[in-house]
């Protein structure tokens, strides 16, 4: 499935307090489910990977191709 990375943005849409960690914001999230197709405007967001939309946060997230890391799968994984 490649490396799942979360965009650093979180709209806090489901939180009472936007600073509550009610939805993971780590860049190496392995959370499954609750994703939808990325809006068309994020077609080129993920550089070396595929985009999916985090429903709870309404933000794009990248599933990186093997050997790539970063929020946008923009960096080569030197440890790969």
């Amino acid at each position: 499935d490649g490396n799942s990375t979360r965009s650093p943005e979180t709209n806090g849409l489901l939180c009472g307090d936007p600073e509550e960690n009610c939805a993971a914001t780590t860049t190496q999230s392995k959370r499954k489910g609750h994703f939808s197709r990325c809006p068309k405007q994020y077609k080129h967001y993920c550089i070396k990977g595929r985009c999916r939309f985090v429903v709870a946060e309404q933000t794009p997230s990248c599933v990186c191709d093997e050997g790539y890391i970063g929020a946008r799968c923009e960096r080569v994984d030197l440890f790969y």
């Epitope: 965009s7 943005e9 967001y45 933000t59």
Partner: antibody
């Protein structure tokens, strides 16, 4: 609490330039996408531009493409909008808003008037 | 570009009324739609996201429905503080707003 405070608006002649700033506080600025949205007097809302949390993914509305530049300084918790070649139709209240797709927090806006 | 068309442009209603505002997209946007409320001289406030999800802190009298091209915002029982202008916004293709619906006191 989350706060966004715009500044830099004012009166400018057609063809002129202006730089807007948006100071953010109350949240971890570097984690969030931020947008500019404008509203002409008595008119509706128009999305202008957004920038992702790292400053590497940017989009503009067709109406401002090639004239406006969005940027951010995460060390200063500040968003910018450099506006060049201003036109009368750019006259509006400019809001910065948190988010790229949806806008859950907004500033109070700063008025830009383009007139000779 | 995706155009968003709201109807009606304005409406008059009384406190306690059920109010419905519709928004139509020029092409399918799945459920990538938000609703905002704006009062004169103030910034907009997010009410609904993903077509039907209520934003935190928003009263439950507000609800959204629809998918594809046709969407609805419903206020089940209009309150005095609800008199305002409402905007829909699509975020599938680059973000665009509807022209707004002004809800006035009858």
């Amino acid at each position: 609490q989350v706060q966004l405070l715009e500044s830099g608006g004012g009166l400018v002649q057609p063809g002129g330039s202006l730089r807007l700033s948006c100071a953010a506080s109350g949240f971890t600025f570097s984690r969030y996408w931020i947008s500019w949205v404008r509203q002409a007097p008595g008119k509706g809302l128009e999305w202008v531009s957004y920038i992702d949390s790292t400053g590497t993914f940017i989009h503009y509305a067709d109406s401002v493409k090639g004239r406006f530049t969005i940027s951010r300084d995460n060390s200063k918790n500040t968003l910018y909008l450099q506006m060049n070649s201003l036109r009368a139709e750019d006259t509006a209240v400019y809001y910065c808003a948190r988010g790229g797709s949806l806008f859950d927090y907004w500033g109070q806006g700063t008025l830009v008037t383009v007139s000779s | 570009d995706i155009q968003m068309t709201q109807s009606p442009s304005s409406l008059s209603a009384s406190v306690g009324d059920r109010v419905t505002i519709t928004c139509r997209a020029s092409q399918g946007i799945i459920s990538y739609l938000g609703w905002y409320q704006q009062k004169p001289g103030k910034a907009p406030k997010l009410l609904i996201y993903a077509a039907s999800s209520l934003q935190s802190g928003v009263p439950s009298r507000f609800s959204g429905s629809g998918s594809g091209t046709d969407f609805t915002l419903t206020i089940s029982s209009l309150q005095p503080e609800d008199f305002a202008t409402y905007y829909c916004q699509q975020y599938d293709a680059l973000n665009t707003f509807g022209q707004g619906t002004k809800v006035e006191i009858k």
